[in-house]
């Protein structure tokens, strides 16, 4: 069930809150409510100031890598979720993420999912 | 079918003011962002402001910042650019183009007008 | 802000390859769009999102981003590619969309 600060969106985003040591990947799944004939599907770090990084994109059937090949995005098999993952994550890799789906045309739409926190913590 | 009309430019002289109007039909208007982008003559495009689908907020590029006003009446499907002080170097093709936005995800200018001529000179 | 550098121009022969790139500071974070734009005519939007075809786009155009720098390549130059080429991303800092300079394209 959807709590009261996460409502029902068409692009979920889990966990809410993931903590890692760094070294470790990072994992969250994007799942969509529904499959849409054409769609991209990028995966973006929100900075403080409301900026925001694509990491890495889904695209038509091809993964397309960002700026850094850390960051890496797997279709599952039943089609509608997506793992993100960071391979190794660092300590300044904690922040605030999200994903999002842009349905192309003839129905272009801009669904984004809730945002995640990600935290890495020093390795102990 | 998608139509974005500009109208509005004319010959001004420099100092002078100009209302541009953009007349959009075959799409949910109040749904979009909307931009102006201009072209001056043999140079690139040149993104001159945006609009929120709601009309709330708005944002120019800084050559044109406390002159030019965009707005929108999403009850008559048009988008306006408000243009005062003129000057020579604001003389170009003006378009106007549609946009589909999320929140922090931004999308793409889809649709563009023919555009229409604003010439400042005296 | 946030600057694309393109070439002026390039010269293409007839049916070979055209490799048009743009760079940008870490442009491999950003969607990056392009347009073909014919003398007296509108901007066409040609590719998006790095490196989709909008309908109607032949299949010759196609785009790709890694790193800084994004490519737009069409595979055969025809004589009705001859056009100038831009590039497009948005600029979260500045909150603007940032146009390249453009690339004056002709086919020999």
């Known amino acids: 069930l959807d709590s009261p600060d996460r409502p029902w969106s068409p692009l979920t985003f889990s966990p809410a809150q993931l903590t890692v040591q760094e070294g470790e990947n990072a994992t969250f799944t994007c799942s969509l409510a529904d499959i849409p004939d054409s769609f991209v599907l990028n995966w973006y770090r929100l900075s403080p100031r409301n900026q925001t990084d694509k990491l890495a994109a889904f695209q038509e059937d091809r993964i397309e890598p960002g700026r850094d090949r850390r960051f890496r995005v797997t279709r599952l098999p039943n089609g509608r979720d997506f793992h993100m993952s960071i391979v190794a994550a660092r300590l300044n890799d904690s922040g605030i993420y999200l994903c999002g789906a842009i349905y192309l045309p003839p129905n272009t739409q801009i669904n984004e999912s809730p945002r995640a926190e990600l935290s890495v913590t020093e390795r102990t | 079918e998608v139509q974005l009309v500009e109208s509005g430019g004319d010959l001004v002289k420099p100092g002078g003011s100009l209302r541009l109007s953009c007349v959009a039909s075959?799409?949910?208007?109040?749904?979009?962002?909307m931009n102006w982008v201009r072209q001056a003559p043999g140079k690139g495009p040149q993104w001159v402001a945006y609009?929120?689908?709601?009309?709330?907020?708005?944002n120019y590029v800084d050559a044109v910042k406390g002159r030019f006003t965009i707005s929108r009446d999403n009850a008559k499907n048009t988008l306006y650019l408000q243009m005062n002080s003129l000057r020579a170097e604001d003389t170009a093709v003006y378009y106007c183009?549609?946009?589909?936005?999320?929140?922090?995800?931004?999308?793409?200018?889809?649709?563009w007008g023919q555009g229409t001529l604003v010439t400042v000179s005296s | 802000s946030y600057v694309l550098t393109q070439l002026p121009s390039k010269s293409v022969t007839l049916n070979q390859p055209a490799h048009i790139t743009c760079g940008g500071d870490n442009i491999g974070s950003k969607s990056v769009h392009w347009y073909q734009q014919k003398l007296g005519q509108a901007p066409v939007l040609i590719i998006y999102?790095?490196?989709i075809r909008p309908t109607g786009i032949p299949e010759r155009f196609s785009g790709a981003t890694s790193g800084n720098t994004a490519t737009l390549t069409i595979s055969g130059a025809l004589a009705e590619d001859e056009a100038d080429y831009y590039c497009q991303v948005w600029d979260s800092s500045a909150k603007a969309w940032v146009f390249g300079e453009g690339t004056q394209l002709t086919v020999l």
């Open positions: 609009i929120n689908n709601a009309g709330s907020d708005r």
């Open positions: 999102y790095d490196s």
């Open positions: 183009a549609s946009e589909i936005r999320g929140v922090v995800v931004v999308g793409h200018l889809d649709y």
């Open positions: 075959g799409f949910t208007f109040s749904r979009y962002y």
